[in-house]
């Protein structure tokens, strides 16, 4: 027959186990703490990096955006799209009509001090917002040229020139040496596209990204 | 990683926590009950057992006559 | 409610949550435990008196001789 | 070489009109640049007043807005001022200019001037 | 409108002598800045456009430097055919203002 355990070796026995059982929650529990702990101070700390990023990122356009109005994009209270105030926004741009009138090498100068760029116009839908904020008497200048006056058209922003999304007026482009472009509303055809000499000074439009904060 | 982002592994990974030490829990309970229950039946069996054992041995010893 | 909001309120839901059931968990493994070995000990008991009153009654029988 | 001439009454009594010619030779003025009237009054002090564009837009100075046009003439090449309900603060020497030389840097063309004096 | 000032108003030199014209714009022009001089009786001439380039004929004497709002003409070893008066003009914005005028005479 087995020798019985003694009741001291018996109690040592639940002892270590207690402590083992107990060591182990213990150790969970400050896993949990820490994860807890991570969950919030790092949130806080990004907060914290994401709030001063985002100063920062203001602080760039404040010389020449003193206020934007933004939006909040999606459900995420993190995500905010922003144009400077007096802009107006579609899609992923926001948009300024400049009523100064200026030729096109300084309309788009103009444009550039403002982080922005002359108008890149991708779609038809993008036209009609435009022209709701056009006046029919003026003529505004788009970021399209052909400096080399080739009839190789191209965007200030580089993006292809597409001869399918174009909104020319009819007979237009017709002049070699009138190497930029406006948008402005003839009675029969409304609003497209004309070619004049860049130095005369027209009003323009600006297009930039929107501003993520 | 973004603020949302990491608040939803965390989440994730206290959710599978509590999961696991969820079942480990029911299951240790369940065993508990289950021991319970074993080592309900196996004390009364032992006594009941017992009893009848000792009944059918004495009954046996009652009506065993030796022969004569 | 926001949703990040939203998620650090279920961090900490998840994390007391948590908390608790290890607690218990570990509660419930020691209780098991200690039951474990009171009923080791009071099985046991059962089975050494078993064994020994058997081996009483069956030597009894052996040596009671038949009246001849 | 381009070359431009005003022409036009010297005298002209307040509250009528002023009207003044800017003769353009050696240059198209539907081709290209913008046409502009410019005056110098006797303290010296320029103003540019507006302009008419080689495709016939027009541009006014805003304090001159009401009072102001610029039309032309393209089968004469000329074009022309005319400014309402003149007074004596009207009075200076009116001159023409080519625009957008230079990519619209300066007024490399001017014509030689003309003095209009508002008296009655 | 963006409004130039131009100084000094007067000025007075003799032959051979360097002088400067400043001209101070209430906004930045981005070296959109010409200088032209004038002559009693006469049209104002383009001497410099976009603020440092000089027009064809002009005498390197004239130099034109500045950004911004700040921009200034300097004549260096004045010849007497320089006396007369100077006026800087902005070609940023329509309308396109010219500074007070500075006059030049000789001693």
């Known amino acids: 027959m087995v020798p019985e355990e003694e009741p001291q070796d018996r109690e040592k026995g639940l002892w270590w186990f207690q402590l083992k059982v107990w060591s182990m929650a213990v150790v969970s529990i400050l896993l949990l703490s820490v994860c807890f702990t991570v969950s919030s101070v790092v949130p806080h700390n990004f907060m914290y990096s994401k709030t001063v990023k985002r100063l920062s990122k203001l602080r760039e356009y404040q010389q020449y955006h003193p206020s934007l109005t933004c939006v909040m994009e999606g459900k995420d209270i993190e995500d905010w799209s922003c144009c400077p105030t007096p802009w107006t926004s579609f899609q992923s741009s926001c948009y300024f009509i400049s009523t100064g009138m200026q030729s096109w090498t300084k309309s788009q100068k103009n444009c550039s001090v403002m982080g922005a760029d002359l108008v890149v116009i991708n779609t038809r839908e993008e036209q009609d917002f435009i022209i709701q904020n056009l006046k029919r008497n003026s003529s505004y200048f788009l970021g399209l040229s052909d400096p080399g006056g080739r009839r190789h058209w191209q965007w200030v922003d580089q993006t292809p020139y597409n001869e399918n999304v174009t909104f020319w007026h009819s007979g237009e482009p017709n002049n070699l040496d009138e190497r930029c472009a406006i948008i402005n509303f003839r009675s029969s055809e409304e609003w497209g596209w004309n070619d004049i000499h860049c130095h005369v000074p027209q009003k323009s439009i600006c297009k930039m990204k929107k501003i993520y904060i | 990683l973004g603020e949302p982002q990491l608040c939803y592994i965390l989440d994730a990974i206290l959710f599978l926590y509590g999961i696991v030490l969820t079942l480990l829990y029911c299951r240790l309970k369940i065993q508990v009950r289950k021991a319970a229950i074993t080592s309900y039946e196996k004390s009364d069996g032992v006594y009941t057992g017992l009893s009848t054992r000792n009944q059918e041995t004495y009954e046996t010893l009652k009506h065993e006559k030796p022969p004569q | 409610l926001g949703e990040p909001q939203l998620c650090y309120i279920l961090d900490a839901i998840l994390f007391l949550y948590g908390i608790v059931l290890t607690l218990l968990y570990c509660r419930l493994k020691i209780q098991v435990r200690k039951a474990a070995i009171t009923s080791y000990e009071k099985s046991d008991g059962v089975y050494t008196g078993l064994s020994t009153r058997n081996q009483e009654t069956y030597e009894t029988l052996k040596h009671e001789k038949p009246p001849q | 070489d381009v070359q431009l001439q005003e022409s036009g009454p010297g005298l002209v009594k307040p509250s009528q009109s002023l009207s003044l010619t800017c003769s353009v030779t050696g240059y198209s003025i539907t081709s290209a640049y913008y046409w502009n009237w410019i005056r110098q009054f006797p303290g010296n002090k320029l103003e540019c007043m507006g302009y008419?564009?080689?495709?016939?837009?027009?541009y006014y100075s805003p304090s001159l807005k009401n009072r102001i046009s610029i039309t032309r003439d393209t089968s004469k090449n000329q074009f022309f001022l005319n400014l309402n309900s003149v007074t004596t603060e009207d009075t200076a020497t009116y001159f023409c200019?080519?625009?957008?030389?230079?990519?619209?840097?300066?007024?490399?063309?001017w014509g030689q001037g003309t003095l209009v004096t508002v008296s009655a | 409108d963006i409004q130039m000032t131009q100084s000094p108003a007067s000025l007075s030199a003799s032959v051979g002598e360097t002088v400067t014209i400043t001209c101070r714009a209430s906004g930045n022009i981005h070296n959109y800045l010409a200088w032209y001089h004038q002559k009693q009786g006469k049209s104002p001439q383009l001497l410099v456009y976009?603020?440092?380039s000089l027009v064809d004929g002009v005498p390197s004497r004239f130099s034109g430097s500045g950004s911004g709002t700040q921009y200034s003409l300097r004549i260096n070893s004045l010849q007497p055919e320089d006396f007369g008066s100077y006026y800087c003009q902005h070609f940023w914005i329509v309308p396109y203002t010219f500074g007070g005028g500075t006059k030049l005479e000789i001693i």
């Open positions: 976009n603020a440092k």
């Open positions: 008419i564009t080689y495709d016939g837009n027009n």
């Open positions: 200019a080519r625009g957008g030389d230079y990519d619209d840097g300066g007024f490399a063309f």
